[in-house]
């Protein structure tokens, strides 16, 4: 029988994955540094814009793919360039933890934009 249309990852699934990769972790991706981003400017695409530059790190590939799927479903998502702090670099683990905190807040308040 024909396969169903692919469901995008849910906010809950993203949270579960972010928890999974950050728990009991002091570092991720060998301490790789990424640009800090303003998550209020379209959190999925903003986070992806920074994290997409991380390679050779299997730990965050699932997160990258989830963000890509969520960013892809936004209207004209590829056109939006998120606000990025070009003078501030932080560790991958810090960005992921920031994203987790932000996404949890969005989830709690039911604002799934």
């Amino acid at each position: 029988s024909p396969s169903p249309v692919t469901p995008s990852p849910t906010l809950k699934e993203l949270i579960e994955e972010l928890v999974n990769i950050t728990q009991n972790q002091a570092s991720l991706c060998n301490g790789s540094m990424v640009w800090s981003v303003n998550l209020t400017a379209g959190m999925y695409c903003a986070a992806l814009e920074s994290l997409i530059n991380v390679s050779d790190c299997s730990a965050i590939q699932r997160t990258q793919r989830m963000l890509k799927a969520l960013c892809s479903q936004k209207p004209a998502a590829g056109q939006i360039s998120s606000e990025r702090s070009r003078d501030t670099k932080i560790e991958v683990i810090q960005l992921v933890k920031n994203l987790l905190t932000y996404v949890r807040g969005v989830y709690r308040h039911g604002n799934f934009r």
Epitope: D56, K68, G78
Partner: antibody
Framework: EVQLVQSGAEVKKPGASVKVSCKTS????????MYWVRQAPGAGLEWMGY????????SYNQNFKGRVTLTADKSTSTAYMELSSLRAGDIAVYYC????????????WGQGTLVTVSS | DIVLTQTPLSLSVSPGETASISCKAS??????VAWFRQKPGQSPQALIY???NRYTGVPDRFSGSGSGTDFTLRISRVEAEDTGDYFC?????????FGAGTKVELK
Amino acid sequence: EVQLVQSGAEVKKPGASVKVSCKTSGYTFIDYPMYWVRQAPGAGLEWMGYIDPYNGATSYNQNFKGRVTLTADKSTSTAYMELSSLRAGDIAVYYCATAVVATDVMENWGQGTLVTVSS
Amino acid sequence: DIVLTQTPLSLSVSPGETASISCKASQNVRNAVAWFRQKPGQSPQALIYLASNRYTGVPDRFSGSGSGTDFTLRISRVEAEDTGDYFCLQHWNYPLTFGAGTKVELK
């Protein structure tokens, strides 16, 4: 060494289904998704979708309008691609591939499986 | 879907010269472009990811550049083994999409 070995060439009738397998070795199967890409004769590459063997999550190219089903068998480290309602436009070489270094950039490819649709 | 337009469709280069292939995206894909080479009867081989990063084992004669919508693959000091079809891929957005390809031949 990462190896992806695909099943042999298939000849199918219009309207039938085909199931191509991709047996993997040399890496941990559940660590990376399996991508499927096809190439019609003398044409370019077309991404069909991927499956994450870790949790069964899939992403499909909607151009295939639900005709593609991707599955993975963790016990044998084998991925499968099934394409239904075959037509002449589906004649192509079908590839499985994995992306290890960069997310969604397929650097390890199977040898390809030619699927022919003929009445 | 993001459309990738590759130019030229074919390219004839003398050994030792430089070949340049362009890939233009229909929308901003940041630096998420990869390049592949495919020889007749073979599977594609990944050369470059994230616009400018070479895979292990790929000669430094291959270089990628660009961001946003305009990307270029350069092959300097072209050798006989560089012939084949070259494809770009955008890996910013789903569905992943490829350019139509550029055939590189030796003069």
